[in-house]
């Protein structure tokens, strides 16, 4: 077990009659009292606020409110703590705590308690919606927490309503008990305003409680008029209307994805959108509420719209062999056609759909450049350029070679790469290797992919030596021995230390 | 620091009544309850009861209901034993002794006795 | 009401040895709800009050020396003193403070 108890949240009673508060409570099994004691209190769980005692099972000491009137029905030693208070007046109505007490420090304040309601009038029970030609049940209901008294229920001003039923005495939720009768009836126009009456008596008693109900015949609204489904070009302006019929008059909302743009009780209920943005484009509901119901209809607004940028997602670097993938997308009413150019060249288009994949398999160094992706409907066009860059190992074009020219001999080492490469130029004769970081005898320039690199030697010598050019990137290495053109004669400079 | 003084040792007749006294200080005297201990000259410690110095309700072990009254004056942080009807076999010395306790309900977090007065003995003789 | 029973009533252990003193509850004292065992231990000299050494069974005090520990759970416990001090002279009480409040009978600890 552990620290808990059990009663009713709420209780009633008629005035003069008696009530039963059921309640169990429970402590861990650990703490094994020789015996349990127990407190009620009334309106405050807090001995230092000097609550009434309603009842103490350690003492006969009660309030002066309770003397006479409580009593212990549960046995405490079998964690029943019900309590019986008998003549009960409006004064005893409020809170009502126990407290356990198992000697030692255990001794523990409940914080359930139960809300004890003094009554004098049956509860007529009418629904909320009473709705025109719809059967609906009356019901009337009132205490049976009273074990000594039981109460008996008749309905007045009931004819031609039906006849009741009485279903008895019921046990609530939280082991209260309550007497009912009920009258079934289809509620006319005519019978707004009608005065039901049911009365509670108590036999052998002059104990006699009557209540009464007036029927209040409404119906729900029905949206009447409305547009049917909307075309706006972006910039226009637009009006949308709604009317219901209801009694009472309607809440009139209209509502977008859940927000509220305009409400008013009102048969009728205008919308006015102006300068419209394809961000209003959408569905419209008109919701009309009363307390008695409620109806809704919808209207679809179609804002007609050119092309946004097209946005390309996908990778724009890529290695030679591998397959890109390109993903242009949109956004427009109607939806365009989507096209994706290289050099004029169309490579791929699809018709009004709001995305295009450019699939490009084993990419080649041709591969590599600008390309637009162009999206066009009736209402203009835009478009978005994007570079693809191919990235490949050297290749050493034909056109290196090397040529003498009086006292000097150059040697051109062209290659195409991506990323660009570095260029060496070596001597295998003289067992020299000159870089293109040595500036003095190398020149490069690039354009585009292909990089030149122009070594020049100047000097003396009698046969013109063998240059090879070697040009690498992290994709690999490319060389090639430089063929001569031209005179053999080399004039030749010391490079290095 | 915690300290609990206890009032000085009495001797009294049978029959009559003592109200022995228990001053706290060095702690907010409404946070902890005061339980009260009695030992018999040469013998074992009992359990009287403890009252709960916030609301100030005091519980009774089931040996010591009937002539023992526990009581409070807050405003001076004290706690009181009164016996009554004194009997030969009452003569003991009564300590207090603090406990953490909680106003509203239960709290099993801490209910041990942490700090005690220095004793009060009560002769009971004719 | 929860019987508590200290072994043995009286012992004599030498100064620097281990001292062991048993309880033993008639019903357990571990509460379910937090797990925690409500049992204490307390220390007293002749003339003074009962000095808090142990509480939640092996949780000791503080400003109390290491040598004293705490062990056990439900009914059976023991207090140790890993190694005697003369100032350890006195008697020790077990104390159950999860029902109506009980106190062992008290073991006497002498020096041998």
């Known amino acids: 077990g552990h620290w808990g108890a059990w009663m009713p949240s709420s209780i009633s009673a008629f005035e003069g009659t008696c009530v039963s508060i059921p309640c169990r409570f429970d402590f861990p099994d650990e703490l094994r009292p020789a015996v349990v004691h127990g407190v009620w209190y009334f309106n405050s769980p807090y001995p230092k606020n000097y609550p009434p005692v309603v009842f103490k099972s350690r003492t006969q000491v009660v309030h002066e409110s309770f003397q006479g009137r409580s009593r212990l029905l549960g046995d405490l030693g079998l964690r029943n703590c019900t309590l019986l208070l008998s003549n009960v007046s409006p004064e005893l109505g409020g809170k009502y705590y126990f407290r356990g007490d198992l000697g030692g420090y255990n001794q523990y304040t409940f914080s359930e308690h139960s809300v004890l309601d003094i009554v004098n009038t049956p509860n007529i029970v009418v629904p909320p919606e009473v709705v025109a030609g719809t059967e609906v049940e009356v019901s009337c209901m009132v205490p049976d927490n009273c074990p000594e008294l039981r109460p008996e229920l008749s309905w007045l001003g009931h004819e031609g309503l039906g006849e009741p039923a009485v279903l008895g005495r019921l046990r609530e939720d939280e082991g209260t008990w309550v007497q009912v009768s009920l009258l079934h009836f289809v509620p006319t126009r005519e019978a707004n305003g009608h005065r039901l009456g049911c009365q509670a008596s108590f036999p052998n008693t002059t104990l006699q409680f009557e209540g009464y109900a007036s029927m209040d015949v409404k119906y729900p609204p029905v949206i009447v008029e409305m547009n049917s489904s909307v075309e706006a070009i972006e910039g226009s302006h637009v009006s949308l209307l709604c009317g219901a019929d209801s009694n009472p008059p309607p809440l009139l909302t209209w509502m977008r994805d859940g927000t509220v743009l305009r409400e008013a009780v009102a048969e009728s209920l205008l919308l006015e959108l102006e300068e419209v943005t394809p961000a209003e484009d959408g569905v419209y509901a008109c919701l009309a509420e009363n307390a008695y119901g409620q109806d809704n209809r919808t209207v679809g607004l179609s804002v007609m719209y050119a092309p946004w940028k097209p946005t390309v997602n996908g990778t724009m670097v890529a290695v030679e062999g591998e397959t890109v993938s390109i993903l242009c997308s949109t956004q427009s009413n109607p939806d365009p056609i989507l096209t994706i150019f290289k050099e004029k060249q169309i490579l791929s288009t699809v018709i009004y759909e709001s995305e295009l994949q450019l699939e490009l398999p084993a990419v080649s160094p041709e591969d590599d450049g600008e390309y637009w992706c162009v999206a066009e409907n009736q209402y203009g066009q835009r478009a978005t350029a994007f570079n693809l860059s191919v990235e490949f190992a050297p290749v050493l074009l034909l056109e290196s070679h090397c040529a003498a020219a009086r006292d000097t001999v150059q040697c051109l080492c062209v290659v195409k790469s991506n990323p660009e490469p570095s260029v060496a130029f070596e001597l295998p004769s003289r067992n020299v290797t000159v870089n293109e970081s040595e500036r003095e005898f190398v020149y490069s320039e690039r354009s585009g992919l292909v990089l030149t690199s122009i070594l020049t030697l100047r000097g003396q010598a009698q046969a013109p030596p063998r240059v090879i050019c070697t040009a690498r990137n992290l994709y690999g290495a490319k060389s090639l021995e430089l063929p001569f053109q031209g005179a053999h004669r080399l004039m030749w400079a010391k490079i290095g230390p | 620091q915690v300290q609990l003084v206890q009032s000085g040792s009495e001797l009294k007749k049978p029959g009559a009544s003592v109200k022995v006294s228990c001053k706290a200080s060095?702690?907010?005297?409404?946070?902890?309850?005061m339980n009260w201990v009695r030992q018999a000259p040469g013998q074992g410690l009992e359990w009287m009861g403890w009252i709960n110095t916030y609301t100030g309700e005091p519980t009774y072990a089931d040996d010591f209901t009937g002539r023992f009254v526990f009581s409070l004056d807050t405003s001076v942080s004290t706690a009181y034993l009164q016996i009554s009807s004194l009997k030969a076999e009452d003569t003991a010395t009564y300590f207090c002794a603090r406990n953490p306790i909680n106003y509203y309900g239960i709290n099993y977090e801490g209910y041990v006795m942490d700090y005690w007065g220095q004793g009060t003995l009560v002769t009971v003789s004719s | 009401d929860i019987v508590m029973t200290q072994s043995p009533d009286s012992l004599a252990v030498s100064l620097g040895e281990r001292a062991t003193i048993n309880c033993k509850s008639s019903?357990?004292?571990?509460?379910?709800?937090?797990?925690?065992?409500?049992l204490a231990w307390y220390q007293q000299k002749p003339g003074q009050p009962p000095k808090l050494l142990i509480y939640w069974a092996s949780t000791r005090e503080s400003g109390v020396p290491d040598r004293f520990s705490g062990s056990g759970s439900g009914t059976d416990f023991t207090l140790t003193i890993s190694s005697l001090h003369t100032e350890d002279v006195a008697v020790y009480y077990c104390?159950?403070?999860?029902?109506?409040?009980?106190f062992g009978q008290g073991t006497k600890l002498e020096i041998k």
């Open positions: 060095g702690y907010t005297f409404t946070n902890y309850g």
């Open positions: 019903h357990s004292v571990l509460y379910s709800s937090n797990q925690k065992n409500y």
């Open positions: 104390h159950q403070y999860l029902s109506s409040l009980t």
